[in-house]
């Protein structure tokens, strides 16, 4: 006999990266008929919602009107049908941004390169932080972590046209509190690739520095259970 229900899906709208003092909604999607949803923050009960009527609702929303560093951290949710509780959802890392200062992002040898050239991004911030994050904007947000006293370098290695795009970086004061974003840097990669082995469908990055794909609401795929299950936002752990 089943002792627990399938885990719900958790995500943040409009994004898991929330500028301080801005609003964010944490969404938890379980099953129709769930009479209670619980949101947990850093392992403790944070909020409860009891949908009405439960048989017509399979998703609840927990609204945070004013994001700050105390609200940043790891969230999960569970739901109950009758007396039976679900497994906990994957962890959602909610990050507060626009804290303190703005880093500077640059790219060497330049913003326009030939496919196959080595490219390195540099993120610099003169205030007290030692962790930096590089994000590529778009359908899926790649996040790479780097370390350094005032500057971190992010070597992409030989680039392909898949590396084209707009990049920003952040200084990280802790796992869930990030600086203002840098000004964007648009990387253009030109040149036809003769060696197709150099042109993966998506850029490849060092496994130890790149987190999982972080799907944002712009993908329109939040409701794809299998996909969200597979792409849980566990970057920062």
């Amino acid at each position: 006999q089943q002792q627990t229900l399938p885990k719900p899906f958790i995500w943040a709208e409009p994004h898991f990266m929330v500028p301080k003092e801005k609003q964010v909604t944490i969404c938890c999607q379980g099953n129709y008929g769930a009479v209670e949803y619980q949101l947990h923050f850093e392992g403790s009960l944070f909020a409860v919602d009891r949908p009405k009527p439960p048989e017509r609702i399979n998703k609840v929303q927990f609204y945070i009107p004013d994001m700050n560093s105390r609200m940043a951290g790891q969230y999960s949710c569970i739901y109950r049908v009758g007396e039976l509780w679900s497994e906990p959802s994957n962890l959602l890392d909610l990050v507060v941004t626009e804290m303190y200062d703005t880093p500077t992002l640059s790219v060497h040898p330049g913003p326009e390169v030939i496919s196959g050239e080595k490219v390195t991004f540099y993120c610099r911030l003169d205030t007290a932080t030692s962790m930096f994050l590089l994000l590529k904007e778009g359908r899926s947000s790649h996040v790479q972590r780097g370390y350094g006293k005032v500057q971190a370098e992010f070597p992409l290695g030989p680039v392909t046209t898949a590396h084209r795009g707009t990049y920003r970086c952040f200084g990280s004061y802790n796992n869930h509190a990030w600086s203002f974003p840098s000004e964007p840097v648009k990387l253009l990669v030109t040149g036809d690739i003769e060696n197709t082995s150099l042109a993966p469908e998506d850029p490849t990055f060092p496994a130890d520095t790149w987190g999982t794909y972080l799907l944002t609401t712009e993908t329109g795929l939040q409701k794809d259970h299998a996909l969200w299950d597979h792409t849980a936002q566990n970057l920062l752990r």
Partner: antibody, heavy 118, light 107 residues
Framework: EVQLQQSGAEVKKPGSSVKVSCKTS????????MHWVRQAPGKSLEWFGG????????SYNQKFKGRATLTVDKSSSTAYMELSSLRSEDTAVYYC???????????WGQGTTVTVSS | DIVLTQSPATLSLSPGERATLSCRAS??????LHWFQQKPHESPRLLIK???QSISGIPARFSGSGSGSDFTLTISSLEPEDFAVYYC?????????FGPGTKVDIK
Amino acid sequence: EVQLQQSGAEVKKPGSSVKVSCKTSGYTFTEYSMHWVRQAPGKSLEWFGGISPNSGGTSYNQKFKGRATLTVDKSSSTAYMELSSLRSEDTAVYYCARRDFHSSFDYWGQGTTVTVSS
Amino acid sequence: DIVLTQSPATLSLSPGERATLSCRASQSISDYLHWFQQKPHESPRLLIKYASQSISGIPARFSGSGSGSDFTLTISSLEPEDFAVYYCQNGHSFPLTFGPGTKVDIK
């Protein structure tokens, strides 16, 4: 020691083609892109195009696209620049230059003089 | 294309004097601006990268400044071997372009 050794001077007729070589040594050829820059007599420098030996990817100055071809031979660590349909305005010194991924053109060949004259 | 304008076209100075060379870009190129020196019958030589960063082996009297669209190369005290043509180069986007050059000659 990094060295870029270019082929010798060429005298060509209008309408013909020229192929200049740039043999490299002292570094890993596939790690740096190779660019070509030309300089007409008494004039400034003009970027011709670049090629990544790693991928074969190229980028050309649109001014020369269609007439220019950049290639590499990885086995001999040599880069080539070919320019077709030559005209008198193509008379110049042609340089190969390595593009460092942390700066710009850090090493240059000695230059190859191409004279186009009927 | 990014057009680079250099001024003055010619700078006539004496050894020991300070030389200030200007380079202006037709649009903002952040700090993706490099400086080269070229002497007669020689290949260009990289002097300054990314507007202000020094190059190993280049004398400390050469320095660069600027960002966006206005850049300056300064030679603090001219040595006899510094009389040459100086080019700025756009490293921001293709086509990579060079300025027309500033000739520093002996007064």
